[in-house]
């Protein structure tokens, strides 16, 4: 079963996707696609990493985060409910039978009418039931999949502000991270 | 346009190990997105997949056959080859190489193929 | 694994016929379905990819539709050349697996 993250239209929506390289800059290829994963890479790939580079976009759909550290999750600008449905995210790493594939469900809500609230500055207060803890294998995930109410493109925004707090670190942890070597 | 071209014995004897190659000539084995695989057919039968390398260094090999089976890849010689072990009878079949090349806009056309080898297995 | 059955094993029409070759998955395989044909003493021909879409210089007579579970390949109007054996094949979940084949023959 698909973990389900949720935006409203209009917004950025947020799919994370982590994983460690073996050393620094010694990334494995990674890709995106709208659709469950396959056999082979993505279908209908919307991004695509070498072990270089982001060699392969379509707009709209952009890595937010520093991938040359693992962090391979997803942006979907300005979103709309076409853009609901299953995401791949694929970890093309080297060896026997050794590829991660995560299938992230995306859920768009119509977009609310209502006046936005002040943002809470407060991680804590914002987000209570934030996971923080660290996986220890690498077929164990954590998401935020448990975690169905928080508006992710909140958690997205805030996570950009504090990107080198520890708070930023929390938040990556509670993602899908894979680490390799 | 890539062409694969087959080699390797066409008799095996029980117990021993099979050994094909398949020289890629047209591209370059190690190019992106491509993923090399070997497929059989028993004689009279449906395909079977035995498993890929992709450009990626990433493996896979059917269950069915996983303990027995190594595909590898020579970037010198442009090739890459197929090893399956403690051959029976059983393993007799045309075994095909193919390659995929995965392409952002079309997928997956598996439009490449080798001429296929009859390997037998009898003493 | 997921096992692809194919229907009618055998199918006998006459050139200019409009045949239709079914096959089902034991689960759902999205659109990531595959046809082939293969003659004798060749190797497969990549007909149709991701269940509707025709490979390179593959004529219009072939199409494909479905998705899920239960996929149907369709020649409109059959030409000599495609009296022959076709499989579909599932990329979905490793293994890869093909179905059994239907046999396309001469009436």
């Known amino acids: 079963s698909e973990v389900e993250y949720r935006a409203e239209v209009g917004q950025n929506a947020y799919l994370p996707c982590f994983y460690t390289p073996a050393a620094p800059g010694n990334l494995v290829p990674v890709c995106w696609g709208k659709g469950a994963c396959p056999v082979f890479e993505c279908g209908n790939v919307v991004l695509r990493t070498d072990e270089r580079d982001v060699n392969y976009w379509t707009s709209r759909y952009w890595l937010n985060g520093d991938f040359r550290k693992g962090d391979v999750s997803l942006t979907i600008e300005n979103v709309t409910l076409a853009d609901s449905g299953i995401y791949c995210c694929r970890i093309q790493i080297p060896g026997i039978m050794n590829d991660e594939k995560f299938n992230l469900k995306l859920v768009i809500k119509p977009a609310k009418v209502t006046p936005a609230p002040t943002r809470q500055r407060d991680f804590t207060a914002a987000f209570p039931r934030m996971l923080t803890t660290r996986g220890h294998g690498p077929a164990e995930t954590q998401t935020l999949g448990s975690l169905p109410d928080i508006n992710l493109t909140q958690i997205s925004t805030l996570a950009n502000e504090l990107r080198d707090s520890r708070l930023a670190n929390d938040l990556r942890d509670s993602g899908a991270t894979i680490r390799i070597g | 346009q890539v062409q694969l071209q087959q080699s390797g014995p066409g008799l095996v004897k029980p117990s021993q190990t099979l050994s094909l190659t398949c020289t890629v000539s047209?591209?370059?084995?190690?190019?992106?997105?491509?993923?090399w695989s070997w497929i059989r057919q028993h004689p009279g039968k449906g395909l079977e997949w035995i498993g890929y390398?992709?450009?990626?260094?990433?493996?896979y090999y059917n269950p069915s056959l996983k303990s027995r089976v190594t595909i590898s890849v020579d970037t010198s010689k442009n090739q890459f080859s197929l090893k399956l072990s403690s051959v029976t009878a059983t393993d007799t079949a045309v075994y095909y190489c193919?390659?995929?090349?995965?392409?952002?806009?079309?997928?997956?056309?598996?439009?490449?193929w080798g001429q296929g080898t009859l390997v037998t297995v009898s003493s | 694994e997921i096992v692809m059955t194919q229907s009618p094993a055998t199918l006998s029409l006459s050139p200019g016929e409009r045949a239709t070759l079914s096959c089902r998955a034991s689960?759902?395989?999205?659109?990531?379905l595959a046809w082939y044909q293969q003659k004798p003493g060749q190797a497969p021909r990549l007909l149709i990819y991701?269940?509707?879409n025709r490979a390179t210089g593959i004529p219009a007579r072939f199409s494909g539709s479905g998705s899920g579970t239960d996929f149907t390949l369709t020649i409109s109007s059959l030409e000599p050349e495609d009296f022959a054996v076709y499989y579909c094949?599932?990329?979905?979940?490793?293994?890869?697996?093909f179905g059994q084949g239907t046999r396309l023959e001469i009436k």
């Open positions: 390398i992709s450009y990626s260094g990433s493996i």
């Open positions: 047209g591209g370059s084995i190690s190019s992106g997105g491509y993923y």
């Open positions: 991701d269940a509707s």
């Open positions: 193919a390659t995929a090349y995965y392409d952002l806009l079309t997928g997956y056309p598996f439009d490449y």
């Open positions: 094949q599932q990329r979905s979940n490793w293994p890869i697996t």
């Open positions: 689960q759902s395989v999205s659109s990531y």
